[in-house]
Each structure stands twice: as C-alpha cells, then as structure tokens.
Interface confidence: low
C-alpha cells in the first residue's frame, strides 16, 4: 500500500504563438481545480477506461477574474497535493490523465458549472520511494507543469511497496535471514507470509498465505506469463494454469463499433478505429469540434470549427490514432541492435546496451580484444568498452610492445639510485637510509627504524624490491 502524490506547479499558456484566451472574465469569474486518474502501465490510456489505480480531485483554486486586455497569465492554483492512495503493489509503470477543470462562478441558475479546460495523458516508469519526478505536458495552447512521486505507507517498503518492515525486536540486529529495511535501518524486513512458492518477482501478498499476481502474470504462484503466443485462439478469459487465452466469444462479435468504426481485438478487450469525426470507446461520440479539445496527449487540433466539419488531430511524436489517443510502441520495431534493451521514455527512445556495445542504438561493437593480441605475454582486458592490455613485468604501452623502465617514476627515496633488474627494480640507498625504496632513515647510533635488518644485509646495502 502507498500513496501517489501529484504537485501542480503551474498551468498557463504554453510557449509559441496562439496564446489562449483567459478562461475567466469580469462577467464570468472562475477558479481552477484538477483531477488525476491513474491506471496500471499495461492498461489502455483511452480516457473511457476506469482509473484502476485510483483518482483524486484537488481543492478549488482562488477565484480569478481576468484583467481586460491582459493576456492569460499562469492561473492561480489550488493549495496542496493531489494524493491517490493505492492498496496493492505499486506497478512501476503507470498511465496518468491529468485534467484541468474550470468552475464558473457567474450568475448561473443552479450554482456553479464546470467545463474541462485541458487534459494531458502519458505513460511513465516510476519506482516507489524515489525522488520527485518533474514533467511538462501541453494540451493545445495550454501548458501544465507538475511533479509526482509514489511513496509506500508503513509498514510497506521497496520499489513496489510489497516488502513489509517491522520495528526490530532486538536492538542490535535483525533475525536470521531478515535484512534491515533501507532507509529505515532501525527496522527489519518482516518475514514473508505469502503462500509457499509465490513468485518474489511477480507475486505479492497482503494477507498470510495468499499470492496475488502483478499485471501480466497469472497462476496460483504468479509464475505463468499471460501470453497468447502458445494458444490456438486469442479469445476468452485467461486460464490460470497455462496463461493461455482459451476460446470463447470474441469481443468483436457483432461489431460493437458504431458509426462505421472497425473493430480489432486486443489481448484484453477490443479497440475501435473510428472514422473521422467520431471517437469514443465505440465511436459513439460525434459532432465534436476543436473547441471540445478532442486531441489527446498534446495533439494539435485543426479545422472542425462546427460539428458538420471534421477536425484533424496532428499528433506529437510517439502518439497516433484519430485523436492521438494511442501511444506508438516504438520498441516493437526493435530499434536496439546487438541485444540492447529498448526503453520508451515517452519523450525519447533509449537503448540500454549490453557490455561491449555502445551508440544510440547499440550499433558500435566495442569488443576490441577480438583479433587484437597484447605483445610480450600481455593479456587483453575489456573494461568500460575500451581495450586495455595488462602487460607482463618489464613491458608497458598500449600493446605491451614498449620495454618498461621501472626507474622512470623515480621510486627510490632520499637520493637512492635506481637500477633496472629483470624482476623489477633495485634501489641503492644513500648513506643513512635503508629499505626497499630507501624510505627508512638509519638512526645515528646504528639502530634502524626497522626492528632489524634482514639477515645478510647491512643497513647501507642496496635492497632489491621484489
């Protein structure tokens, strides 16, 4: 269990031309409030789907009246955070919809009325317990700046809030097999009480003996990935034992899409591709104009001044669909080469390369040791993507081709003379000094700073450094 927290920093006109009119006026004073809707990461971002992770509404902001002739400034915001408690594990990847609402306080029968000013949506990765993440989203001519984080509610800890912590029973250490709870080092991880064999990666529990699965996993121990790949038919409910989707009535049977929309099945439900001028889960919403803000995810609406003329959404990179409602799965094109891991960060595509590869798409092979020998008995070492030779004694340089001069660094202290030797170097110490590097002074009475000179060596003798 834990809480998702959202802090709105500003809402106002975005950069560039076409600054929006202020939503409030002397005739129609208004105030803003915000609504956030959260969904687990694998769920559809479509606005019609429920807020499965939770939703929250902010307080009302201060009443605002536009000064005549002034451009719309950043509008006064409500105080405080929007907090969305979540009961189960934090999913790590989540979808959000943040709406900016206007409460009109003009002389209206029946009190105030509300209208949607802007809506932004996106998908993000976020570990619970991490720092605040900052974001900027644009909806038409408006810009919303905000920060968000997920934090666990005690006794839960960890990036998914699935580990439990309890105060230590003994002051010094945790019980056998139990780790301290970072960052609460004075607490210990509670013993796992899940059903025996419950997957530690894909399952969790809140009650003793249960095993609840994170999204994408199934089975009594959450060890079976939900997949249609090995199934005969991609229809019907998931089988808990195989993870296959067993045959059943298809979600597109009878075509649920209205107004000439075409239906395609998805792993969880169906999706309607709507003709221009229609949108909604089943293409049932029509007559929409640009004034209604039909373009999701910061799409730019063009045309559609009245319900009889169709609008067109020009989608920002990473989104598609007639209303920019679908996120392009850019990783499905497998842009990362050489086994690199693809990360779609929303604003950019990132490849996490395997060791030995680099470049934006992991296209550069850094394995310089392949086909490259180190001379004179040296061995090639790969590290940080660069080739390096570990040279045998007496040799140096990039490929161990240069004879090393062990005396180059002047290793003999107090004026001692250095001699190169097949096994290293030898220091001939100046009078009054001794040691492998002539580092120890010999006391005037003949006693050295060392407990005793090694047998067979007088304090003034050269010492060989092995």
């Amino acid at each position: 269990a834990g809480v998702f927290e959202l802090q709105i920093h500003s809402f106002g006109p975005g950069p560039g031309p076409g600054a929006p009119r202020s939503p409030c006026s002397a005739r129609l004073p208004c105030r803003l409030f915000f609504r956030v809707c959260l969904k687990p990461g694998l769920s559809e971002e479509a606005a019609e789907s429920p807020c499965a992770l939770g939703a929250a509404l902010s307080a009302r902001g201060p009443v605002y009246t536009e000064q005549p002739g002034a451009p719309a400034p950043d509008l006064p915001l409500p105080d405080g955070l929007l907090q969305v408690p979540f009961r189960d594990a934090w999913p790590g990847t989540f979808s959000f919809i943040i709406e900016t609402w206007r409460e009109e306080l003009g002389d209206q029968i029946g009190g105030p009325a509300w209208s949607l000013l802007a809506r932004v949506a996106g998908r993000r990765r976020l570990a619970a317990g991490g720092p605040w993440a900052r974001d900027i989203q644009r909806a038409g001519a408006w810009e919303l700046r905000f920060s968000y984080r997920a934090r666990c509610e005690p006794p839960a800890v960890g990036t998914a809030c699935t580990r439990l912590c309890r105060p230590r029973s003994a002051p010094s250490r945790c019980g056998p097999g139990l780790r301290p709870c970072a960052p609460l080092e004075d607490e210990c991880e509670a013993p796992l009480v899940c059903r025996a064999g419950c997957s530690p990666e894909h399952g969790f529990c809140e009650q003793p003996g249960e095993c609840r699965c994170l999204e994408g996993w199934t089975g009594p121990l959450c060890t079976v990935p939900v997949s249609t790949s090995s199934c005969l038919s991609p229809r019907g409910p998931s089988s808990a034992t195989t993870g296959c989707l067993v045959p059943g009535p298809g979600p597109c049977d009878g075509n649920p899409c209205a107004n000439g929309g075409s239906c395609s099945e998805t792993p969880r439900s169906f999706e309607c591709t709507c003709p221009r001028g229609f949108y909604g889960l089943r293409c049932e919403v029509s007559g929409v104009t640009c004034a209604d803000g039909p373009c999701f995810n910061g799409g730019l609406c063009v045309g559609g001044a009245d319900p009889d003329s169709a609008y067109i959404c020009h989608c920002p990179p990473g989104f598609q669909g007639s209303n920019c409602e679908k996120r392009v799965d850019r990783c499905s094109l497998q842009p990362c080469r050489n086994g690199g891991l693809c990360l779609d960060l929303g604003h950019a595509l990132r490849c996490r390369c395997r060791a030995g590869f680099a470049g934006p798409r992991c296209e550069h092979d850094l394995d310089d040791c392949a086909g490259r020998a180190c001379a004179n008995g040296g061995t090639c070492v790969e590290g940080g993507g660069a080739h390096r030779c570990s040279c045998a004694l007496g040799f140096g340089g990039r490929d161990c081709r240069e004879r090393a001069d062990p005396c180059a660094a002047r290793p003999c202290a107090h004026g001692g003379r250095c001699y190169a030797h097949f096994s290293g170097l030898v220091c001939a110490c100046a009078p009054g000094y001794m040691g492998a590097r002539c580092e120890f002074p010999v006391h005037p009475d003949g006693a050295s700073a060392l407990p005793a000179a090694p047998p067979g060596l007088r304090p003034g003798d050269p010492q060989r450094y092995l």
Epitope: E48, W101, A113, W114, S115, L116, G280, L281, E284, V285
Partner: nanobody
C-alpha cells in the same frame, strides 16, 4: 446507478411542436456535454444537437437548425429539446447521450412520430 430517461415523445401533426426531456441521475451531469441523437427506421443514428457542460455553447445539425432548441438545467440534472415546425422526416426514436472525456452514457430513447 447511472440513468438517462427520455420523455415527451408522441404523435404530432406536421408543423406541430414537442418538448423532449432527459432526466439524468447517478453521475455528475453538470460536467458532461450532452447531445440529442435520433434514429429513423432503417437509418443510421444521427446527432441532432449538442450543448456544452456549462450550457454556453450549442451546435445543431443542418436538419435541425432554426427549428430545434437544445437547453439544459444543471440544477435539475435535465436536458431539453424544443422541437418546432415538425416534419414527417423528423419521425424517429430520439436518444439523449451524455459525453465526457472519460465516459459516455445513453438513454433508452423516446419515439416521436410526425404524421397527419
């Protein structure tokens, strides 16, 4: 439980008038844009009129312009459609539908028959 219940339909002579009502319950009506649709026998459903959540913006299909007026009373959670100068081609089942960014709700419809 969400409900949209249309009423006011019936038989009327050409040139006559009717006022349809749509009573909403179970959701925050005043945050929804609301529409009147109609579907004549054997025809596709068409949108007749829409009104914004605050009631400040209205739009009409060409077939309804100048004859129909859409209005709402958020204090009563009710939508209206005043239909004047009715014609035979206005005969249809009339539906109200509430739409918002996150949900859509439909009524069951009320039958309007224009006949002499």
């Amino acid at each position: 439980q969400v409900q949209l219940v249309e009423s006011g339909g019936g038989l009327v002579q050409p040139g006559g008038s009717l006022r349809l009502s749509c009573a909403a319950s179970g959701f925050d009506f005043s945050t929804y844009t609301v529409n009147w649709y109609r579907q004549a026998p054997g025809q596709e459903r068409e949108k007749v009129a829409r009104i914004s959540s605050t009631g400040t913006t209205t739009n009409y299909a060409n077939s309804a312009k100048g004859r129909f007026t859409i209005s709402r009373d958020n204090s009563k959670n009710t939508l209206y459609l005043q239909m004047n100068s009715l014609r035979a081609e206005d005969t249809a089942v009339y539906y109200c539908a509430a739409e918002r960014f996150d949900s859509n709700y439909w009524g069951q419809g009320t039958l309007v028959t224009v006949s002499s």
